[in-house]
Structure formats: C-alpha cells, structure tokens
Amino acid sequence: DWVVAPISVPENGKGPFPQRLNQLKSNKDRDTKIFYSITGPGADSPPEGVFAVEKETGWLLLNKPLDREEIAKYELFGHAVSENGASVEDPMNISIIVTDQNDHKPKFTQDTFRGSVLEGVLPGTSVMQVTATDEDDAIYTYNGVVAYSIHSQEPKDPHDLMFTIHRSTGTISVISSGLDREKVPEYTLTIQATDMDGDGSTTTAVAVVEILDANDNAPMFDPQKYEAHVPENAVGHEVQRLTVTDLDAPNSPAWRATYLIMGGDDGDHFTITTHPESNQGILTTRKGLDFEAKNQHTLYVEVTNEAPFVLKLPTSTATIVVHVEDVNEAPVFVPPSKVVEVQEGIPTGEPVCVYTAEDPDKENQKISYRILRDPAGWLAMDPDSGQVTAVGTLDREDEQFVRNNIYEVMVLAMDNGSPPTTGTGTLLLTLIDVNDHGPVPEPRQITICNQSPVRQVLNITDKDLSPHTSPFQAQLTDDSDIYWTAEVNEEGDTVVLSLKKFLKQDTYDVHLSLSDHGNKEQLTVIRATVCDCHGHVETCPGPWKGG
C-alpha cells in the first residue's frame, strides 16, 4: 500500500499555496506513529522547497507555481519513519508530471528570412523555408504546434497571392504565374506563426523573396540606324559605337551583349566587339577600305546576349551605312618588285628598263620618279617616264654590290597630291655574264728544287660564268718554255708547271698565258724560286755549313 500514482500538476497554478496534491500514507500507522518526509530535486535539493510534506499527515504540498518549460517532471522519494527514527517502509518513488499551459507564443528563428527564385518559374516551385519555435508542448497538446500562414504580400503585383506557405513545414512556394524581375524585383511577405495548430497565439516575421534574373528580355538597338564615315585604308579604325538597351540585370550574362555582322561585309572588312562597361558594340575596320572600289558599305548587325534566351525572343538588328572617304593614296609600283635581265658592261646611256607606278586615286595625278638607292651609282631614272638607263659600268663580278648576279636598286614614285604621297619599288637587275675576265692561276708564287723537281699544280680561276670558263688552255711565252712546261689537266681546271732544265738557285719569272673556253686570254707572271735541293721544298734551305 506504500505507493502513489503519478501526480499531474498544471504549470502556472494560481494557488493558494501551499497547495495539497496527494497524501502519502503507510498502513504501518496503525501500529505506531509515523512521520513522513520527502527527498530529491525540488524537495531537499535544488530547486529546494518547491515541494514539501506535512510531517504527520503525509500531505504532499506544492509551495509555488510550476514552469513546465523549466522542469517538466519531478522525481521525489517519500520516506516513512517511526518515532524513534527507524524506517518503517522502503523509500517510495513519487513522479510529479507538470502539464503544459499555452503560456508561450511562437518565435521565428529570424526577424527577416531571405530567399530567392528565378523569374518566370512554374507555380509550385519552392522558394525558401521559414521556421518558428514554440516552447510549449507539441506532443501531448497543440499548445506548441505551429501553423504558418502568409499575412500579406508587398507589392501586390501582378496578384496579391504570388506565394503560398506549407502550414506545417513553413516552406514557401510560388503559387501564381507572373513573377517578372523587370517589374517586381523583390517581394516582402509578412508571415505568421500561430500556435494551437493555427488557433492560438500569433507572431510575425518578414520573408524577403528576391526574384532572380532570367534572360527573358532581348537587347534592343537604340537607335536602329547609323551613318558613319571612315577614311579609306584605315585598319583598326573605330567606325561606330552601337547602343543597346536590355531590361535584364545589368552586368549579368543575360544583359551583356554579343554582336554579329549578319550581312553587308562580303570582304570581311569589319569586326565588332562588345565594350565591357557600356555594353556598346564597337564596330572597327579589320582591313582597309578602298574608296575607289566601293565607297559605301551597308552593314546589318544582330545583337543577342552572352546567356541564351529562356524563351523565343525576336532579335534586334541595326543598319549601319558606312561612307568611305577618299584619301590621297601613294602610287604603287607595278609590280612592287621588278626583275630585269641586263647584260653587264652595257654602254653608258643604254636603256635598262621602264619601271612605272600606278596611282590608286581616280584623279589623273602626275607621278614623278627618282632613284632612292643605287649603291654603285650605275643607274639614272627619268623623272617623267620612269625610264632607267645605265650611267656607269654594270659589273656582274663586283662582289661589293652584286649578290648572286643580282644588283638591287630602290626607286621612288611621288604624286602631285596635296600633300604628296610616295611609293617605293624594288628593281632587281639580273646581270647577264659577259666574257670579260680571263683565267688566273693560283698560287702565283712557287718554290721548286732544281734537282728531281716536283711538278707544281696551279688552280685556274675565272670570275666569269660558264660557258666563259673551263676548259682552259695554257701556253708559256717570252722564252719561258725553254726551262718550263705548262700542261692543263684532263678536267681543264688546273695547270701543271714543271722545271725541265737545271737552273741555279735564284728567282725567275715564268710567263704563263691562260685562255678560257671563249678564248679570253690572260697573261700572268709566276714568280718561281728555284732552290738547290732535291724533290719537294717549301722554302730554300740556307747555305750548308760544315763543322
């Protein structure tokens, strides 16, 4: 019989206190006087003194109002002792359950919630979730069960109910069509949380819904027609800046313009880029324009965005009429580099060629000519006709001025425009070889022994070109053939000089005549040092001294 059922006590009781809750009773009180006491948190340990017991009657007392949100359940022990203090019962467990009262309002976890949703989404799309808490009990009562609702929406555009909220979870969703960032970029919702599952206390907060940009607006040219003037031949010249307006979010891919020349640029003369700040289309020349060929270009430019359109949108097109302005253009030699074959050594005053320039301009301008660079000073140019004549001896073999048979001259043409312009041309004279050089032996000094002499092989060179070179022929003159012999080898490009009679040690002149395939003859004196020696020698030995 020493038991007590769990005791339920409502929180926030108004008393009067102490308030009798239940009576502890031991059936041992028939035999002896019993004294009752309680222990545990809420009695003799913190929070002390909430509960007490009438020592002699066993009445369990509540001394003050309870707060379920602070302590929802107390676990105490009841004790029964006799007059002499001896325990007459085992300690008894006393459970006191604090029952809830709806004494707390819901509280939103934030004063302002922020969420976002893309403009133009389907109704039903989830936006964000809001949360409110309520300290009251939501398990055994509805005191802490929160129901969410939207109290108001600002602006009320295009409908006053663009959003809905899940009454239990606080999830906000789009409910209506017509979210348009360009009209309403942000909605402010006043949201409510009401306890008792919607029938109790209410609290409010704000949910701000940002409408995110979708590329649902096409960029539009403003104006759509342009006229521009560009000097001919200018490359990289800014022709025109094209302006567009786009209702989408500035500096976003849905706003940034992409330009495309759709037509009118057959020669690929123009290019268009987007200015990173202004979003304007900058039309420039990729190649020089030619006034004489075409003095007006009509371009058609289309504009889209970096981001694709989210729906089918009509694209805007601009028309740009580009007027090409005439400029005084430099005369152009035709061809820019002229190759002319001319025989070397032609007489002074002999014509070489006529080299003229054409003026791209339509007016009949007068062109005058002059030589700009003539390293050897061999040529003259008529200022009116462009006739080039020889004033010096053109020498193909002149290694200082001629490279690979070519003599390079730069000429200049000047028009009589205001201001005058000049153009240059290159004249490449390919000098045709003439047999104007005889063969020459190398070396022209030899050293030879007067006893058992070694044959001296001399290389034959000729500055001219074939066929004015080998095979060569050799002949000794001026009695040189008394002591020497000269024979050309089989290939005809070397001469072998041999001493055929004894000569005493000394230096001698050997007169050697060489002729080329075109019979051009060249006499060369070979200095021959004869030494007193046998066979091969490079320098004469000094006089022998005995010891």
Partner: antibody
Framework: EVQLLESGGGLVQPGGSLRLSCAAS????????MSWVRQAPGKGLEWVSA????????YYADSVKGRFTISRDNSKNTLYLQMNSLRAEDTAVYYC??????????WGQGKMVTVSS | QSALTQPASVSGSPGQSITISCTGT?????????VSWYQQHPGKAPKLILS???KRPSGVSNRFSGSKSGNTASLSISGLQAEDEADYYC???????????FGGGTKLTVL
C-alpha cells in the same frame, strides 16, 4: 471569351510520334503557366506536363519523362506537346489547361490519342 | 491508386443535398488552402466549380459549396438537379512534384 482549342490527336502505332497543339485566345497567354492533363478511358485525371509563361521552366510526370516535350510559342499563343516513343498506356484524352493559383482553369475540349497496332 | 481519396459514387434525389469527401495528407489537403473541385459530364472536358476550398468562379451556381477540416476537403451540393449528374474530381496543391494531386473521381447519380 477565354478559350483553349486542342488539335493533332489521332491513331498512332506503338513507338510512333504525335504532336498536340493548343491554341489559346481571350487572355494574355504569355503571362500564364500551361499544362497538359490526360484521362485514360474510364479512368481519372493525370497531370502530364507543365511549362512556365516564358517557357523557361518545364515539368514532366515520371511516366512520360524523356519521351514527351512540352513547348510554347507566345507569338502564336500556342502550346505544344511532342509525344515520341508512344506506348499503349499513353492512350487517353489529352487536355490543355492553364495552371496557376493551385488550380487548373480553363480547360480545352480535349483530344483523343490512341496508341494501337 | 489516386493520391487523394474520394468515394467512388454518391447519389441523391432531386432537391436533396449531398456531400463528397476528398481525403489527403498533411502535405497536400492539410497543408494548403488550394483544394479545387472539377465537374465532368460524359464526353466533356472537366470544368472548375470550386477553387481555394470554397471560391466559386463566376457562372457557377451557389448550390455548390466547399469546406476543409484537417486533411479532408468536402464538396456539398444542395438542391440537387438532374444536370448535376456527373463525375466530380478534387485536386490539391502539394509541396513538391507533381504539385497537383487528383482524387480518383466520384460519380454522382441523381435518382
């Protein structure tokens, strides 16, 4: 008067394709999300697909995902449903309807699509 | 199996009143006040008769009314008339796809 008028239904073999159109009049078509709902013979209503007013956002029921494509041309005030790889279970009356404010209204008169060999 | 539960059929005599129930869950009917009712005559398209639980579109008779309690919505028709004989479908907005759930439909017979 607000009106939706479907066209393009008919008989098609399994695996075949069909395109339904829905011409809208009497309201600002581009301002409203649109949907397709179907009803198999003797059965209830099934939401098939939806598209936002701009056409930038779409939804498909699992049963048709990957086979059906919803689109719209706001310049022509017309909604489309391209149906590919059709199956016998796609046989139904197909309705177009405006979708918003948690409801479907108005509805077109419906077009019968029969998938049979 | 439909997401929302409706009785397969109800009947009533002319002049009587009937009620059709539509039971969902706390994520659809219970969560939002976006329950709609549609009337469908044989061979015709569905026609909206109630939206947002109890709002009648213009042109719909005031004999049709709606209510909601917890996870169950109801359609009431008073003063039954022969032309009320039709199939009635409820629908509810729901959190998450597919956003619209339909009931299986209720056949109303006017005796």
């Amino acid at each position: 008067e607000v009106q939706l008028l479907e066209s393009g239904g008919g008989l098609v073999q399994p695996g075949g394709s069909l395109r339904l159109s829905c011409a809208a009049s009497g309201f600002t078509f581009s301002s409203y999300a649109m949907s397709w709902v179907r009803q198999a013979p003797g059965k209830g209503l099934e939401w098939v697909s939806a598209i936002s007013g701009s056409g930038g956002s779409t939804y498909y029921a699992d049963s048709v995902k990957g086979r059906f494509t919803i689109s719209r041309d706001n310049s022509k005030n017309t909604l489309y449903l391209q149906m590919n790889s059709l199956r016998a279970e796609d046989t139904a009356v197909y309705y177009c309807a405006s979708w918003g404010d948690g409801t479907l209204n108005p509805w077109g008169q419906g077009k019968m699509v029969t998938v049979s060999s | 199996q439909s997401a929302l539960t409706q009785p397969a059929s109800v009947s009533g005599s002319p002049g009587q009143s009937i009620t059709i129930s539509c039971t969902g869950t706390s994520n659809d009917v219970g969560a939002y006040n976006y329950v709609s009712w549609y009337q469908q005559h044989p061979g015709k398209a569905p026609k909206l008769i109630l939206s947002e639980v109890n709002k009648r579109p213009s042109g719909v008779s005031n004999r049709f009314s709606g209510s909601k309690s917890g996870n169950t919505a109801s359609l009431s028709i008073s003063g039954l008339q022969a032309e009320d004989e039709a199939d009635y479908y409820c629908s509810s907005f729901t959190s998450g796809l597919p956003w619209v759930l339909f009931g299986g439909g209720t056949k109303l017979t006017v005796l």
